[in-house]
């Protein structure tokens, strides 16, 4: 379960809130402190919905250790970091006669071909089907023979050369040359039943965060793939109303395992693509799960190639507190893959579940004999540990009361990682490098580059990590810069959003406060989007923007232009978010506090946060509201149904209402199984419906898309029924044929307009 992109980012690629923040001080937006003397316009709802103020991104794709591709005026340019110059790689006129709108492109690693994607049809969060054509960059022409079929589900180049693997009708095919026929790898694919090389619904959403279940070996010899069997998985069914002319609605059926239901099973195979032949079926060699997994239901949760002939697989028990990493070597004499028990690495949790959402991926050294991995240390903080494949124990190379977010690159001399160590701010992100020959030699590469403007970084490294792009996303306007790893020198500014900065000078923008409160001797962070000319002696209505799912973070240093920007700027509403128990990146003591107890502490902590905010003197405690989407909709509903008396009103969009309705992988990770022997009692007493009576004390707006494949409309339907049954008056809105994101242009505008009216009415605003 993830917050829809639109909620996190406003419109895709958009961000938020001007001005600089120094924690915990609030610096107001440039301009006069006198609100009456400020004639500048505010950031309006229309500005948000129409994306008037557009953040500029600088998207690049590294194609070597010193070159990347980027788009400019629809031309594809190649930038050479060595020489610091750009040249045209492909002119936008190249495909003028193509006859299709190109959705995406992908260059083969040897630079000889470009794969063109069109006829894009979205399926779920990551999955889609499309048509593909291949353009020969040497001959400057489209390849017309032996084309990839329409409605292809996934395509990927091999890591070197120009082999292609693709999935069509749930079966895998390989092309050795773009203009040669495909070799069929699997023959068992069947819609909604057997998936080869692609994920089913739950693996896509909750395990791999991808449609692809194919993994090329580094030199493109082997192709590893997973096969999912959903034969016994129950179907979720919902109506799709489609065009008005459709007399009978279509029924959508998706294999979707709810908590405690039958799960998909998984098998894993490797095929040698150098020995393919049209006259004989490909020989796929199975790698079976470890014995400790085969005793019960389990998941494949990570696949990482270590070398050309070594692969690591991570498996996870259905009760997600125990995982095993297998390291398997190709045995040339038998053509099999051997996974030695002596090389198995077990990862378990006694306080919760393994990993943040799943076990982290290993980062292997060049020889494949050792790897680095983020795991929980003795104190419950996630840090980098160094493993040798033949040894059980590992050596932590980082430590502290902060967490490593991700390993970004590994060279022979350094490991590069992102962490939230700097200034003890969990909501910040910076890039560090650690010397592999001396773990005490750690350098922060981003901390001091632009410390007021930039406190939240992500990074993109070139192929061998000689260069990197730093992407600063706040608290100031996003800034993209290019750097050399040789001396960590900044080479150039790629995008500084100066045009937007100039535009926003003429807007009364909110400011952002990031601070913490202490509860039971523990720091809990919050953020507040404060109206322009904020005056702490005045009373403001407050909207609590909540997510609060396990390992979530809503208090950060990211700049965003979103609905909250409008509410603060135009309606003078404080929009606050609070990271309570269950939230992430601050150690397992906080994160695992809600283990087996969803709907308890994370809900109570939002109520307590609102109480604390109302004590701050500038909050009108008669005008406190709460809203959230997805898990945030669940928490919103649980809060409003708590009878706390703190909140006047609230909005729940696409909420979970009962954990037995949500998917098995996500739900059971935190709740275990809904059986009497396990955790059925808490499943039953953590429902929104059981709190129906308390909704008489609040104003409630319930919203859901009818075609939500993720959090099913069923969940809101049951809330509605329970409220009606006890005579609660409430407001509701459905969005016909919208999924979990409610993201179509018209629905997006409608939902935010509707919610704005509701909040304004609740706060008695004109």
């Amino acid at each position: 379960m993830k917050t829809p992109w639109k909620v996190l980012l406003g419109l895709l690629g958009a961000a938020a809130l001007v001005t600089i923040i120094t924690v915990p001080v609030v610096l107001l937006n440039k301009g006069t402190d006198d609100a009456t003397a400020d004639s500048r316009k505010t950031y309006t709802l229309t500005d948000y919905l129409k994306n008037t103020y557009r953040l500029k991104l600088y998207s690049l794709r590294w194609i070597s250790d010193h070159e990347y591709l980027y788009k400019q005026e629809n031309n594809i340019l190649v930038f050479n970091a060595e020489y610091g110059n750009s040249s045209v790689f492909l002119e936008n006129s190249t495909f003028d006669e193509f006859g299709h709108s190109i959705n995406d492109y992908s260059i083969s690693p040897d630079g000889q071909f470009i794969l063109l994607e069109y006829n894009y049809v979205k399926q779920w969060r990551h999955s889609y089907t499309a048509s593909y054509d291949i353009y020969d960059l040497n001959k400057r022409q489209l390849i017309t023979e032996e084309r990839i079929p329409n409605n292809t589900q996934w395509v990927t180049w091999s890591p070197v050369g120009h082999k292609l693997a693709y999935v069509w009708n749930n079966d895998i095919y390989v092309k050795i040359e773009p203009n040669l026929p495909s070799y069929r790898i699997t023959w068992t694919g069947k819609e909604d039943i057997i998936y080869n090389g692609i994920t089913d619904w739950v693996y896509e959403e909750e395990v791999f965060s991808a449609y692809s279940a194919l993994w090329w070996s580094p030199n493109g010899t082997f192709l590893a793939y997973a096969q999912f069997n959903d034969t016994e998985v129950p179907l979720i069914e919902y109506s799709f109303y489609s065009d008005e002319s459709l007399q009978y609605p279509k029924t959508v059926r998706v294999p979707y395992p709810k908590a405690g239901a039958v799960n998909p099973t998984v098998k894993f195979f490797v095929v040698n693509t150098d020995s393919l032949s049209s006259v004989t079926n490909a020989t796929s060699i199975q790698i079976t799960a470890p014995a400790s997994m085969l005793i019960g239901d389990h998941y494949l949760c990570d696949v990482t190639w270590a070398t050309q002939e070594r692969i690591s697989l991570q498996w996870l028990r259905r009760i997600q507190n125990y995982s095993v990493m297998d390291i398997c070597d190709y045995d040339e004499s038998s053509g099999r893959w051997n996974c030695l028990v002596a090389r198995q690495h077990i990862e378990m949790s006694t306080t919760g579940w393994v990993g943040r959402f799943r076990p982290s991926e290993p980062h292997f050294t060049l020889d494949g004999n050792s790897f680095y991995k983020i795991i929980s240390n003795e104190e419950g903080y996630r840090h980098i540990c160094y493993f040798q494949i033949d040894k059980k124990d590992c050596t932590f190379i980082t430590k502290g009361t902060w967490e490593v977010i991700g390993i970004e690159a590994l060279t022979s001399d350094y490991l590069y990682y992102i962490s939230n160590e700097y200034k003890g701010m969990p909501g910040g992100r910076n890039l560090y490098k650690i010397q592999l020959s001396d773990y005490t030699k750690v350098t922060c590469l981003s901390c001091e580059l632009n410390p007021e403007r930039c406190q939240y970084y992500s990074v993109s490294f070139s192929k061998e990590a000689k260069y990197y792009q730093l992407r600063c996303s706040g608290p100031g306007l996003p800034l993209y810069t290019l750097h050399s790893s040789v001396n960590d020198k900044g080479l150039r500014v790629l995008e500084d959003n100066s045009a937007l900065d100039k535009m926003l000078q003429n807007v009364q923008m909110p400011s952002k406060k990031l601070d913490f409160i202490i509860l039971n001797e523990t720091k809990f962070w919050y953020q507040m989007i404060l109206p322009p000319h904020f005056d702490k002696s005045k009373k403001y209505p407050l909207l609590l923007d909540v997510y609060a799912g396990p390992c979530s973070q809503k208090a950060d240093t990211v700049f965003r232009l979103n609905w909250a920007t409008y509410l603060a700027s135009t309606e003078n509403i404080i929009v606050a978010s609070f990271d309570g128990r269950g939230s992430g990146y601050q150690g397992d003591k906080i994160m695992h506090a809600i283990n087996r107890r969803l709907g308890t502490f994370e809900v109570e902590d939002q109520i307590e946060a609102a109480r604390q905010f109302s004590k701050m003197g500038f909050v009108d405690n008669k005008r406190i509201a709460i809203w959230g989407w997805s898990y945030g909709g669940y928490v919103t509903s649980m809060v409003l149904g708590s009878g706390s008396g703190v909140f006047k009103c609230g909005i729940a969009v696409a909420p979970v209402s009962r954990w037995e309705y949500y998917d098995s992988v996500y739900t059971e990770r935190y709740m275990g199984l809904p059986t009497p022997e396990d955790n059925l009692d808490h499943y039953r007493n953590s429902t929104v419906m059981s709190r129906a009576e308390n909704f008489k004390q609040v104003e409630y707006l319930l919203i859901h898309g009818t075609a939500d494949d993720n959090v099913h409309f069923q969940q809101s339907a049951q809330i509605s029924k329970a409220l009606v049954d006890v005579g609660v008056d409430f407001q509701a809105m459905w969005y016909t044929d919208e999924d979990h994101g409610i993201a179509s242009s018209t629905a997006h505008q409608h939902i935010y307009t509707h919610m704005s009216h509701f909040i304004k009415q609740c706060f008695s605003l004109p």
Epitope: L180, T221, N272, S277, V279
Partner: antibody, heavy 117, light 107 residues
Framework: EVQLQQSGAELMKPGASVKISCKAT????????IEWVKQRPGHGLEWIGE????????HYNERFKGKATFTADTSSKTVYMQLSSLTSEDSAVYYC??????????WGQGTLVTVSA | DIPMTQTTSSLSASLGDRVTISCRAS??????LNWYQQKPDGTVKLLIY???RLHSGVPSRFSGSGSGTDYSLTISNLEQEDIATYFC?????????FGGGTKLEIK
């Protein structure tokens, strides 16, 4: 550079067996099929069969089942073909070939087998 | 089995000539047709695979075409080193089968 080095010429008696070797270098041995092809003067080229070293999968032309047997030794990167119950019909040049997908990409120099009383 | 027929068993041509060698399959082989060159010393080389794709290192004067059952190999500008026997082979179905060969000689 891909190379297939075949063993030398053999003079055999009728009824005997012969084992021809083909040593592969310059590529990942277990990843490619090795084909065996027979050439008799005036008879053109005849496909005997193939072996995928490592896995050891074999396919034989029906006409050579019982006549030819393929084996592979991955440690020495060598493929062997044994021909049994030799007759004058088996006198020929035998080629080992590395197959790339559906074409015979790299040919050994050939081994002449002569069957004579 | 799929018999492959090279109707011309030998062919005489002059240096610089354009030479075409044909090959017919007894049934559709879906373009899985390869051409090989065998020199008088017995050395065999792949020239063309999948009807028309030139194998690496093969001079561009060699080209292939065809579909269904009928295929041909063309040498656009005959050179001395091209004197050899040329075989076609189908790769569509097991057992693989070869044509009888076309021996190319200089006039």
């Amino acid at each position: 550079e891909v190379q297939l080095q075949q063993s030398g010429a053999e003079l055999m008696k009728p009824g005997a067996s012969v084992k021809i070797s083909c040593k592969a270098t310059g590529y990942t041995f277990s990843s490619y099929w090795i084909e065996w092809v027979k050439q008799r003067p005036g008879h053109g080229l005849e496909w005997i069969g193939e072996i995928l070293p490592g896995i050891g999968t074999t396919h034989y032309n029906e006409r050579f089942k019982g006549k030819a047997t393929f084996t592979a030794d991955t440690s020495s990167k060598t493929v062997y073909m044994q021909l049994s119950s030799l007759t004058s019909e088996d006198s020929a040049v035998y080629y080992c070939v590395r197959k790339n997908y559906d074409w015979f990409a790299y040919w050994g120099q050939g081994t002449l087998v002569t069957v004579s009383a | 089995d799929i018999p492959m027929t090279q109707t011309t068993s030998s062919l005489s041509a002059s240096l610089g000539d354009r030479v075409t060698i044909s090959c017919r399959a007894s049934q559709d082989i879906s373009n899985y047709l390869n051409w090989y060159q065998q020199k008088p010393d017995g050395t065999v080389k792949l020239l063309i695979y999948y009807t028309s794709r030139l194998h690496s290192g093969v001079p561009s004067r060699f080209s292939g075409s065809g579909s269904g059952t009928d295929y041909s190999l063309t040498i656009s500008n005959l050179e001395q080193e091209d004197i050899a026997t040329y075989f076609c082979q189908q790769g569509n179905t097991l057992p693989y089968t070869f044509g009888g060969g076309t021996k190319l000689e200089i006039k």
